[in-house]
């Protein structure tokens, strides 16, 4: 049972991570001006990954996208890149971990299957929270450094008469969407990778083999060692001591670690 | 056909109140941002107060910051300047205007003619 | 605050003329972000309120004729109005559009000689 709400609640942990990579990924505040020399300014600059925007006091709101490829800063480039990777790896991993759910069964896929399944969307959401970190942390290091790059270069005047004021950038929005996004992600996958633990089955399922003894019948199943994954604590044998005899086929699977969790 | 008409202007005594209405038709009023501008032959145009679309934020002049209060009723098409603690300098005709493309001012009315003293 | 100041304070001339005026900021009213200029002109007649004609420094306000054009960046800028007619004779202002206070200049004015 807390396996499978292990897995459940990973499952959504890191679909709401990867829609909050999506929409960060897609928002344009990912650097908004910096008001503190001028917090009644008229004209409001912000920027994302695809575009800028400039909102006026008027309501008025004007985007341009960013129509060159070669024109535009690596780091930029590189930052789309980590997004758009972990968006595809979150992508994936989410339609992999809905046929890994253990709530939801799909044909007589073995628990192992499930198991795997549930580690691979694990790691993919590791992978897909890290790249969005990543990601928003690069570009979170680029503004940090053209901001002080700007403060440094602050004014530029024609004998001190006329000021020139260079526009600063600070953190947008996205960037503290993008971090709790990338979290919630990597805390999913971790989730998920837990869960697997649980859904690796503890032993071989061998058709039990019926002994009549005769006083009361009693069945054994012997406990197969599961194959050594790192995930398995140690197994023990089980025995089910039943009222009556049964028959090989009538030997009902026995219950799985994860159900006594 | 967009249209701003302004009301309330008068004589006043100094350190007296006044209450200026802009009503407005022909456009939707809630979805603009609008001003309050002051001309006086002397110191000629003279921006006084703004108010966003949904009445934040709110701007004012130097000049007039803690006297005036601008406001703006959306569902009545009204723009407002509650003026108080007034003074001779702020003798002038007061026009209601209309924010537009590049923070200019594309509508205006015909303006109130606000005189102060004694 | 941004200070604008505009030249001449009067202007003479006589019809068909190509006519002149300058606008200067005491600030850049460039905006990096988009790369426009917020600065406004108005064309104010007596006892008349003022009247759009240019806004983003150059773009011409609908019903505005052609001969009115605005130029200029960053602190300098010119309202040009390339043959005046009796009807253009009027007081016309700059405005500084970027950044609060939005302020004004005195104004030029256009007379007949």
């Known amino acids: 049972m807390a396996v499978t709400a292990c897995q459940g609640l990973g499952f959504v942990v890191s679909l709401i991570g990867i829609a909050g990579i999506i929409a960060a990924t897609c928002m344009d505040q990912w650097s908004t001006q910096d008001l503190y020399n001028n917090p009644v300014t008229a004209v409001f600059n912000y920027q994302g990954l695809w575009r800028s925007c400039v909102r006026e006091s008027s309501g008025f709101t004007e985007c341009r996208g960013y129509f060159t490829l070669l024109g535009l800063p690596a780091m930029l480039q590189a930052v789309r890149a980590l997004m758009i990777v972990g968006i595809v790896l979150g992508a994936i991993g989410l339609l992999v971990s809905i046929f890994a759910l253990k709530c939801i069964r799909i044909g007589s896929m073995e628990d192992s299957a499930k198991a795997n399944m549930t580690l691979t969307s694990g790691i993919m959401f590791i992978v897909s929270g890290l790249c969005a970190i990543a990601g928003v942390s690069v570009f979170a290091n680029m503004l940090v450094t053209n901001f002080w790059m700007s403060t440094a270069n602050m004014y530029t005047g024609m004998g001190g008469m006329v000021q020139t004021v260079q526009t600063r950038y600070t953190f947008g929005a996205a960037l503290f969407v993008g971090w709790v996004a990338g979290g919630l992600t990597l805390i999913g996958g971790v989730m998920m990778c837990i869960a697997c633990r649980g859904l690796a089955p503890e032993e071989t399922n061998y058709k039990a083999v019926s002994y009549h003894a005769s006083g009361h019948s009693v069945a054994y199943k012997p406990g197969g060692f599961k194959a050594s994954t790192g995930f398995g604590s140690n197994t023990k044998n089980k025995k089910i001591y039943d009222g009556g005899a049964r028959t090989e086929d009538e030997v009902q699977s026995y219950p799985s670690k994860h159900d006594y969790v | 056909d967009v249209q701003l008409v302004e009301s309330g202007g008068g004589l006043v005594q100094p350190g007296g109140s006044r209450k200026l209405s802009c009503a407005a038709s022909g456009f939707t009023f809630s979805g603009f941002g609008m001003h309050w501008i002051r001309q006086t032959p002397e110191k000629g145009l003279e921006w006084v107060a703004y108010?966003?679309?949904?009445?934040?934020?709110?701007y004012y002049a130097d000049t007039v910051k803690g006297r005036f209060t601008i406001s703006r009723d959306n569902p009545k098409n009204t723009l407002f300047l509650q003026m108080t603690s007034l003074r001779s300098e702020d003798t002038a005709m007061y026009f209601c205007?209309?924010?537009?493309?590049?923070?200019?001012?594309?509508?205006w009315g015909q303006g109130t003619l606000v005189t102060v003293s004694a | 605050d941004i200070v604008m100041t505009q030249s001449p304070s009067f202007l003479t001339v006589t019809a068909g003329e190509k006519v002149t005026m300058s606008c200067k900021s005491s600030q850049s009213l460039l905006n990096s972000g988009n790369q426009r200029n917020y600065l406004t002109w108005y064309q104010q007649k007596p006892g008349q309120p003022p009247k759009l004609l240019i806004y983003?420094?150059?773009t011409r306000e609908s019903g505005v004729p052609d001969r009115f054009t605005g130029s200029g960046s960053g602190t300098d800028f010119t309202l040009t109005v390339s043959s005046v007619q009796a009807e253009d004779l009027a007081l016309y202002y700059c405005?500084?559009?970027?950044?609060?206070?939005?302020?004004f200049g005195a104004g030029t004015k256009l007379e007949l000689k």
């Open positions: 205007a209309r924010f537009y493309y590049g923070n200019s001012f594309d509508h």
């Open positions: 405005q500084n559009a970027y950044s609060f206070p939005l302020t």
């Open positions: 983003w420094a150059s």
């Open positions: 108010i966003s679309s949904g009445s934040r934020p709110i």
